[in-house]
């Protein structure tokens, strides 16, 4: 299922970096969230629970990430023009069932004012 464009502010710039916000519904308890740049997996974070309700968080691709109860934020640093691209949040929902995949995204525009280290 493709949801298309994110209906929220997906990119938050600060200190020469960008926070990419990937939201998921409050009801979702177990999931995998992948950050795609074009078709390439940049980052991922998986939250699951074991048979005794113990929570496990794992990242296969290491990125600085932050988990809240309705979003995953991925952080990219040292921005340059090569970061300009379409970015997608690919959400796989394990729980509650049924299994479902949603894709939301947007284009990351890079302006001179957002670059880390401008040459004077």
């Amino acid at each position: 299922e493709i949801n298309g464009s994110a209906n929220y502010e997906m990119f938050i710039f600060h200190n020469g970096g960008v926070q990419i916000l990937c939201k998921y519904p409050d009801i979702v308890q177990q999931f995998k969230m992948q950050l795609l740049k074009g078709g390439q997996i940049l980052c991922d974070l998986t939250k699951t629970k074991g048979s005794g309700n113990t929570v496990s968080i794992k990242s296969l691709k290491f990125c600085h990430s932050q988990l809240s109860n309705n979003s995953v934020s991925f952080f990219l640093y040292n921005l340059d023009h090569s970061h300009a691209n379409y970015y997608f949040c690919n959400l796989s929902i394990f729980d509650p069932p049924p299994f479902k995949v949603t894709l939301t995204g947007g284009y990351l525009h890079i302006y001179e004012s957002q670059l880390c280290c401008q040459l004077k």
Partner: antibody
Framework: EVQLVESGGGLVQPGGSLRLSCAAS????????MDWVRQAPGKGLVWVSN????????NFAPSVKGRFTISRDNAKNTLYLQMNSLRAEDTAVYYC??????????WGQGTLVTVSS | DIVMTQSPDSLAVSLGERATINCKSS??????????LIWYQQKPGQPPKLLIF???TRHTGVPDRFSGSGSGTDFTLTISSLQAEDVAVYYC?????????FGPGTKVDIK
Amino acid sequence: EVQLVESGGGLVQPGGSLRLSCAASGFTFSDYWMDWVRQAPGKGLVWVSNIDHDGNIINFAPSVKGRFTISRDNAKNTLYLQMNSLRAEDTAVYYCARWGHYAFDSWGQGTLVTVSS
Amino acid sequence: DIVMTQSPDSLAVSLGERATINCKSSQSLLSSGYNYLIWYQQKPGQPPKLLIFYASTRHTGVPDRFSGSGSGTDFTLTISSLQAEDVAVYYCQHHYSSPPTFGPGTKVDIK
């Protein structure tokens, strides 16, 4: 098709050790928590232990804590249960089970462990 | 640890009749709108088979004569029209906290 095949059971004396294996196929093993559940002859089901995707989180039933260890080799798609200081009350069929996010959705056929002198 | 109890220990029901199994937990299994309660069926010489999760959701491929209900601490598995292949032991299990525990089982036979 999901398949779980246990091996390593047998007859062992009290105080002895045994290592059970569970070979998994038909799914991405590293995506799932895995568990061991046992069943004494003619009795009910008793949870023994579980392990998360990477082996970073493990839990044990109080009755086996300090005697049993659980591990996994994701490269070999195999789950293990190392059982030390075995007692007569550990006699049971040991099942390997896949935790499918909200239930044990796949079980092996089990391997029988008999602890007796 | 949460203690799970089941009643009756066993029951015999005529073919085509309703079978009802009860499961009780020592504390509430309700969290975030979900009841962390599962039902399994185990036939002689076989491993358990998943029937119902989250107290009332049928697993894929499970016949609709099996249904689960209840909330909090009291749960029920109902077989609306018993078939010969339903002869088995039925277990409830919670996954609210560690350790997950099973009920002692209810044996269902044909009268």
